[in-house]
């Protein structure tokens, strides 16, 4: 059997011949050693017994989408049946005091591969034997501690495969310079050691995407905005736009990135090299936000222009390598290509509470029977829309340990002047956070307040 017979043939194997090879990967036309690595179809009854105590699940993730030319990293994590885990030696053991359907196990090991490898014979002095090989016959690399690596992962994409020895979690990075744009499929088959052979335990596949567009995401933040994810913001307060470029392999680290903004409110284009920008909308309504990101990224060099035809034959210029016209074909050459990314959003601008201020605090005189608590009136003004709710959070003087939170609907006239009355149990210094809210906004003000003892002579005062 060949690799493409075993690993699924999502694409014709001729695909690889039409594409440059992925660095370090091999053609899936190669032969697969079925004696060492048996192949089971989906639904084969042997899968049920491929792992002691249940099925192993493989989870494949990637940091897709990847900008063409950058590296994409795939990670596979094995999830073992309940109560099982991999120990420091790579053996699979039962977790202490963990009860599964079979109850507590007397044997601490699910698989004691250390014991197996010590018992195994037929190895030469290098620790190499005919069974410490991958499905294509290549020997295992002898990294320090390789004996503790008991899983074999075979990655397959674009008519090519990559083999890796590992523990319960592995990562593989692939450069996408030679990968066709668009969605691609990565398949992974996982084997475990089984004496001098291997047993399949899991198969998993995942779609990844290679794109020539810079993957761009914009976060938007505005003070007093109640819900930053609904793309509704407040008039007359700056919105901070922060551009996040998805570049996990740092492909664009040395690129100059330009950001071109159109806020959709007839304020024109704004060009910047900073990934954050502030903008204030001064009218209510719906606006179309557009961002274009431009980066000069490493890319393929253009083919050289054809040499001018000489009018009469000229003597040879010597080997092709000496010909300056051939330089652009040198693969290590540092050519740049402009890559672009786009982001578009429709944002709604509404009235909101712009500001809240405590302008006065008054100690409300109370009858004698309640000397241990104080009633304080906070006179509050606000600007912007009419609040519907007031919340007070009373905490310790550091404003960190909340003692009491009270929220209630509030009736405010168009002048936006209101009085909030709150109870303070005992004297001392308190931090008071007061928020006024409506459907779209939440405005906060804070103050430190010093509540005196119940001696009528001691006045209420704002601390500091």
């Amino acid at each position: 059997k060949r690799f493409h017979d075993v690993l699924g043939n999502e694409r014709p194997s001729a695909y690889m011949r039409e594409h440059n090879q992925l660095n370090g990967w091999s053609s899936d036309e190669n032969d697969w050693n079925e004696k060492l690595y048996p192949v089971w179809k989906r639904g084969d009854m042997r899968w049920k017994n491929s792992w002691k105590g249940g099925r192993v699940q493989a989870v494949l993730t990637s940091d897709s989408p990847a900008l063409v030319g950058s590296n994409i990293t795939f990670a596979v994590n094995l999830i073992f049946p309940r109560c099982q885990k991999e120990d420091a030696n790579g053996n699979i053991v039962y977790e202490k005091n963990c009860r599964n359907e079979a109850g507590l196990s007397a044997d601490p090991y699910v698989y004691n591969w250390t014991a197996w490898s010590e018992d195994s014979d037929g190895e030469n002095g290098t620790g190499q034997s005919h069974h410490n090989v991958f499905p294509d016959g290549k020997p295992f690399p002898h990294h320090p501690g390789w004996r503790r690596w008991n899983f074999i992962y075979v990655f397959h994409t674009l008519g090519q495969y990559f083999q890796k020895l590992g523990r319960c979690s592995v990562r593989v990075s692939v450069n996408t310079a030679n990968v066709t744009l668009g969605p691609q499929l990565m398949e992974v088959t996982v084997y475990r050691r089984h004496g001098r052979a291997y047993v399949p335990i899991a198969q998993v596949k995942d779609v990844y995407v290679v794109t020539d567009q810079i993957p761009v995401f914009v976060t938007m933040f505005q003070k007093n905005d109640r819900n930053s994810s609904d793309e509704t913001f407040l008039k007359d307060l700056p919105i901070m736009f922060d551009v996040l470029i998805h570049d996990p392999s740092h492909f664009l680290n040395y690129s100059t990135i330009n950001y071109k903004w159109s806020f959709g409110d007839n304020t024109g284009l704004f060009v910047s090299t900073n990934h954050t920008v502030n903008h204030t909308y001064v009218l209510n309504g719906t606006f179309s936000l557009n961002l274009t990101v431009k980066a000069a990224a490493p890319g393929p060099c253009p083919p050289p222009p054809p040499p001018p035809r000489p009018s009469k034959p000229t003597p040879s210029l010597g080997p092709a390598g000496d010909n300056p016209l051939e330089l652009s074909r040198i693969p290590d050459e540092n050519c740049q290509i402009n890559r672009y990314g786009h982001f578009q959003a429709t944002i709604t601008i509404v009235e909101g509470i712009l500001e809240v201020n405590i302008i006065q605090m008054t100690d409300v005189l109370m009858p004698v029977p309640w000397p241990e608590s104080s009633l304080i009136d906070f006179v509050v003004t606000c600007q912007g829309s009419i609040p519907t709710e007031v919340c007070t959070i009373i905490s310790d003087p550091t404003c960190e340990i909340t003692q009491n939170t009270v929220c209630s609907p509030v009736d405010v006239d168009e002048m936006c002047l209101l009085t909030v009355r709150r109870t303070f149990n005992g004297s001392g210094t308190y931090c008071v956070n007061l928020t006024l809210g409506d459907d779209t906004s939440l405005a906060l003000t804070s103050t430190l307040i010093s509540v005196p003892d119940r001696d009528p002579a001691s006045p209420l005062r704002m601390a500091n």
Partner: antibody
Framework: EVQLLESGGGLVQPGGSLRLSCAAS????????MSWVRQAPGKGLEWVSS????????YYADSVKGRFTISRDNSKNTLYLQMNSLRAEDTAVYYC?????????WGQGTLVTVSS | QSVLTQPPSASGTPGQRVTISCSGS????????VSWYQQLPGTAPKLLIY???QRPSGVPDRFSGSKSGTSASLAISGLRSEDEADYYC???????????FGGGTKLTVLG
């Protein structure tokens, strides 16, 4: 002068529906929260629901949550209470009231009778 | 069973001073304004006191409200026969997220 006028009450069978209206005048309706309060025959006052000036915030008593819906049309200066899955214990005079942290003006009420 | 507790009845003779109490908790009376409503027989309720002790215009100064901790009270001085009515206290409850009323106090003016 502030005026609140309820309508839409009447006799309805258990499980039935009714929609109450409250026409407001004499103040800037769109700037004020509004509420519904009810009073069963011979009993005390029970708050039912409140709505913010814009209609974005709504509050309901546990006894009506999921069955009653408060709404408003600021262009018509009208407050509504849609009552579904009515029960015998919903029988009461329903008052429309202005504001929600205190009820400073009340309508005269409309009687809702739920009976088979 | 009301969240706010009022005596079911109170009485007094004309000219007397009568006090009606209303007891609650820190989530309602303790940290929110108390209002008092008067309901004359066969009519809609009317706001008598708001913000614990404030009188709307048109309400005589014979009516006064006060609050102490988690209790509030309504005092009526110089009692008159037209004061015979049901009186309700009310406040927003921040824990229940609901407006709560007392069960009401029926005031009888004797003689």
């Amino acid at each position: 002068e502030v005026q609140l006028l309820e309508s839409g009450g009447g006799l309805v069978q258990p499980g039935g529906s009714l929609r109450l209206s409250c026409a407001a005048s004499g103040f800037t309706f769109a700037a004020r929260p509004m509420s519904w309060v009810r009073q069963a025959p011979g009993k005390g006052l029970e708050w039912v629901s409140s709505i913010s000036h814009s209609g974005g915030s709504k509050y309901y008593a546990d006894s009506v949550k999921g069955r009653f819906t408060i709404s408003r049309d600021n262009s018509k200066n009208t407050l509504y209470l849609q009552m579904n899955s009515l029960r015998a214990e919903d029988t009461a005079v329903y008052y429309c009231a202005r504001k929600w942290s205190t009820f400073d003006y009340w309508g005269q009420g409309t009687l809702v009778t739920v009976s088979s | 069973q009301s969240v706010l507790t009022q005596p079911p009845s109170a009485s007094g003779t004309p000219g007397q001073r009568v006090t009606i109490s209303c007891s609650g908790s820190s989530s309602n009376i303790g940290n929110n304004y108390v209002s008092w409503y008067q309901q004359l027989p066969g009519t809609a309720p009317k706001l008598l006191i708001y913000a614990d002790s404030q009188r709307p215009s048109g309400v005589p100064d014979r009516f006064s409200g006060s609050k102490s901790g988690t209790s509030a009270s309504l005092a009526i001085s110089g009692l008159r026969s037209e004061d015979e009515a049901d009186y309700y206290c009310g406040a927003w409850d921040s824990s229940l997220n609901a407006y709560v009323f007392g069960g009401g106090t029926k005031l009888t003016v004797l003689g």
